[in-house]
């Protein structure tokens, strides 16, 4: 039967996305139990039946992947999970509309920092994500992002820095003076969905200037 | 069986403010979201705004924004709509509706009149 | 916000003939994820609370008579009676669930002549 309040077994149901990996999460309210058992249903915007997701059905853990059924960006999905108690007390709670495209946070760029006598050079690799082609391939953020550029900062010294920016992979900060270490940092952004990943941040010393010695 | 019940309707002066009621039973209030429709003597349909019980998250038409508030209370299985400032052209039956696109379950209805 | 259109206004059916109310949107209601549009069909009867009759503009209903049945894309749809029971006079509504605020046509009365 129902509790008098749901939440006391269960609270916080949400998507948690990065990358485009979506990751159902939950807590327990104060009357959960760790031998609490929770199974978990999606659905799409404005389809009538919810389905259950095979691998989270009557499990003790408080997430649940649904990358793979959640892998349309375009769609708008839900998802709740039932709780039950080992008493037989039961509570449903469901997630608000969840857009991967407009939720997922991005997380730092996978970069190669290379130092140099007088400059640095620092290389994006591209971000691979879960979300497939039609043909099969895995996109990256670039191919899901048209308006993705980089953002990347070299801290000269406390007062100044030196920008670079751009849709590029291989960026290069020029003049600098050898052996002395800086701190890039390289941020992706997604002006229309109003992005900003956390900072890859990378400590680097330009090489010793041996044509002197 | 899904039943949602209404309540809380009635007389009210020009000025005031109502809060109605819709009762659940059958299902869980936090499975599905939950719409408020109303619906003027003799005419059509407009819809007031959502909530996802669940959440607490909301919806409203522009048109209702800062007059109109929803909420849940999870314990009781029941939906709540507040209106604030009514004035005559308020005069309705309001409905609660079930689920988050298109109803699949309404409520009976509950008469509000506004008047002096 | 997205305007929905009902045509006629009401008509009158002889019992046993085919009914047609047509609705129109003010922009399309094709979504774009599942190619369906987002359209729903309501009966109302007097005194009572509307019944969903129809959704994705062509689903019908769990225990809704397959005389109702509708049809359409974009911003033109249709819902039939395909055979006018005397149960079937009441006040019919579309309704669009592309884009907040969700909005409802104005009604058209069904009556038999």
């Known amino acids: 039967h129902a509790p008098e309040d749901p939440s006391d077994l269960l609270q916080h149901v949400k998507f948690q996305s990065s990358n485009f990996e979506n990751i159902l999460t939950w807590d327990s309210g104060p009357e959960g139990t760790p031998d609490t058992v929770y199974s978990i249903e999606y659905k799409t915007y404005g389809e009538r039946d919810w389905v259950a997701k095979k691998g989270c059905q009557r499990i003790t853990r408080k997430s649940c992947n649904l990358t793979v059924e959640t892998g349309n960006l375009t769609e708008l999905y839900y998802a709740r999970v039932t709780a039950v108690s080992a008493g037989g007390r039961s509570a449903t709670k469901m997630t608000d509309r969840f857009s991967s495209l407009q939720h997922t946070t991005l997380k730092p760029p996978d970069v190669t920092c290379i130092s140099k006598v007088r400059s640095i050079q620092m290389i994006v690799h591209p971000t691979p994500t879960p979300i497939r082609a039609g043909d099969g391939h895995r996109l990256t953020l670039e191919d899901i992002f048209h308006d993705l550029f980089y953002h990347l900062e070299l801290q000269v010294n406390r007062t100044y820095q030196m920008h670079l920016g751009g849709k590029q992979r291989e960026y290069e900060f020029f003049g600098l003076t050898p052996d002395t270490e800086f701190l890039g940092t390289i941020m992706i952004c997604v002006p229309t969905w109003a992005k900003e990943s956390a900072p890859y941040m990378c400590r680097v010393k330009t090489l010793p200037d041996r044509t002197w010695t | 069986e899904v039943q949602l019940v209404e309540s809380g309707g009635g007389l009210v002066q020009p000025g005031g403010s109502l809060r109605l009621s819709c009762a659940a039973s059958?299902?869980?209030?936090?499975?599905?979201?939950m719409n408020w429709v109303r619906q003027a003597p003799g005419k059509g349909l407009e819809w007031i705004g959502e909530?996802?019980?669940?959440?607490?998250?909301?919806t409203y038409n522009q048109k209702f924004k800062g007059r109109a508030t929803l909420s849940v209370d999870q314990s009781k299985n029941t939906a709540y709509l507040q209106m604030n400032s009514l004035r005559a052209e308020d005069t309705a039956v309001y409905y609660c509706?079930?689920?988050?696109?298109?109803?699949?379950?309404w409520g009976q209805g509950t008469l509000v009149t506004v008047s002096s | 916000d997205i305007v929905m259109t009902q045509s006629p206004d009401s008509l009158a059916v002889s019992l046993g003939e085919r009914a047609t109310i047509n609705c129109k949107s003010s922009?399309?209601?094709?979504?774009?994820?599942?190619?369906?549009?987002?359209l729903a069909w309501y009966q109302q009867k007097p005194g009572q609370p509307p019944k969903l009759l129809i959704y994705?503009?062509?689903s019908r209903e769990s225990g809704v008579p397959d005389r109702f049945s509708g049809s359409g894309s974009g911003t033109d749809f249709t819902l039939t009676i395909s055979s006018l029971q005397a149960e079937d006079v009441a006040v019919y509504y579309c309704?669009?669930?592309?884009?907040?605020?969700?909005?409802f046509g104005q009604g058209t009365k069904v009556e038999i002549k």
């Open positions: 909530i996802n019980p669940s959440t607490g998250t909301t």
């Open positions: 509706a079930r689920f988050d696109a298109y109803f699949d379950y």
């Open positions: 994705w503009a062509s």
């Open positions: 059958g299902y869980s209030l936090t499975a599905e979201y």
């Open positions: 922009q399309s209601l094709l979504y774009s994820s599942n190619q369906k549009n987002t």
């Open positions: 309704q669009q669930y592309f884009s907040y605020p969700f909005t």
